[in-house]
């Protein structure tokens, strides 16, 4: 699979669309998940409605909203205030029970507003922090909330 | 096979300037921030600098904020540092690194280039 | 800045043995840190990241362990490769901050 470069810029929003087979995929759940390492596990961030038919609602988990059109084969991940912590690889992903089919492999860039002080110390603070699905989010005085990563795929 | 070679290390004087380059081959340079991270002789590991995949942003180390700049030529491959204002503090081991997805880790290093800032 | 603080600084063991070497951050890192090992003149090489994800090519003997503010490096039985500097670092979150060092010594 090829991987799709995305760009955003801090603070604002960013639309990643995973299309896919509509009749091959059908009745399969998606999800988003962030790849920890070339070869290694993939973290869930979220996945749509846990009732296939309503896959269409969004469903959010701390800054990171998913929705899938199943009849176009479109699925939707927004990823609201993009702060540079976010900036990574991930995968869409189609479920079929515990195994997971990536759709599509996507980089996130994170960009800051060069007219904001170049100052790396006042780059990392969010407003809103995302958190990982099945992850703790730990607060601290750094730049990102730390978000710990469970080593599972 | 990731491969990442430094070039441009040497002896300067103090207050003077030394352009660093890194050659990266094995993988989509592209699609990968790379940073630079230092070593003193016979002292750990201090990071330096990193950017982003298309070199749209850069971070820094305090240490170096305001006197190092780091760059990239995507088309070349190849990732860059221009030190200025030298101070023998910067003396050290400049090793060139390929940071995982924008994650703060380095999975391939470069061998080292050795900068000696003395007058 | 966090920092992260590394002990023993420096430790004699045998082939065979088995060895921990602790990581301590000044606040919370959740399970963000990565470990190196570097051998004398050479570049690091990166084992462990996210506390427990092998690298690529790590063999099993080496594991990694904690969160929050205390990690353990274990190497199960030491091979004779194994003797080299270890450095803990904090990733995830600018700046990425090393531990001193370990240096592992044979006994």
């Known amino acids: 699979l090829n991987t799709t470069v995305l760009q955003g810029m801090a603070g604002q929003s960013l639309r990643v669309s995973c299309t896919y087979d509509a009749l091959k995929h059908w009745g399969r759940r998606k999800a988003w998940c962030r790849q920890l390492g070339e070869e290694g596990p993939c973290q869930r961030v979220v996945s749509t409605h846990g009732v296939w038919l309503l896959a269409f609602l969004k469903k959010r988990n701390g800054s990171t909203v998913i929705a899938d059109d199943t009849l176009a084969g479109t699925v939707t991940i927004t990823l609201k205030n993009l702060q540079a912590g976010d900036a990574g690889l991930y995968q869409c992903q189609s479920l079929r029970g515990r195994e997971a089919e990536v759709l599509q492999k996507v980089l996130v860039e994170v960009l800051e507003d060069p007219l904001d002080d170049q100052d790396a110390g006042d780059l990392w603070v969010p407003e809103e922090s995302s958190s990982f699905e099945g992850a703790q989010v730990e607060h601290s005085t750094s730049r990102n909330q730390e978000t710990s990563f469970p080593p599972t795929s | 096979e990731v491969q990442l070679l430094e070039s441009g290390g040497g002896l300067v004087q103090p207050g003077g300037s030394l352009r660093l380059s890194c050659a990266a081959s094995?993988?989509?340079?592209?699609?990968?921030?790379m940073a630079w991270v230092r070593q003193a002789p016979g002292k750990g590991l201090e990071w330096v600098s990193s950017l982003t995949n298309s070199g749209g942003s850069t971070y820094y180390a305090d240490s170096v904020k305001g006197r190092f700049t780091i760059s990239r030529d995507n088309s070349k491959n190849t990732l860059y540092l221009q030190m200025n204002s030298l101070r023998a503090e910067d003396t050290a081991v400049y090793y060139c690194?390929?940071?995982?997805?924008?994650?703060?880790?380095?999975?391939?290093w470069g061998q080292g280039t050795l900068v000696t800032v003395s007058s | 800045d966090i920092q992260m603080t590394q002990s023993p600084s420096s430790l004699s063991a045998s082939v065979g043995d088995r060895v921990t070497i602790t990581c301590k951050a000044s606040?919370?890192?959740?399970?963000?840190l990565a470990w190196y090992q570097q051998k004398p003149g050479k570049a690091p090489k990166l084992l462990i990241y996210y506390t427990s994800n092998r690298f690529t090519g790590v063999p099993s003997r080496f594991s990694g362990s904690g969160s929050g503010t205390d990690f353990t490096l274990t190497i199960s039985s030491l091979q004779p490769e194994d003797f080299a500097t270890y450095y803990c670092q904090r990733i995830y979150n600018s700046p990425w901050t090393f531990g001193q060092g370990t240096k592992l010594e044979i006994k």
């Open positions: 094995g993988f989509t340079f592209s699609n990968y921030y």
């Open positions: 690194t390929r940071e995982w997805a924008g994650s703060g880790y380095f999975d391939y």
């Open positions: 606040q919370n890192v959740g399970n963000n």
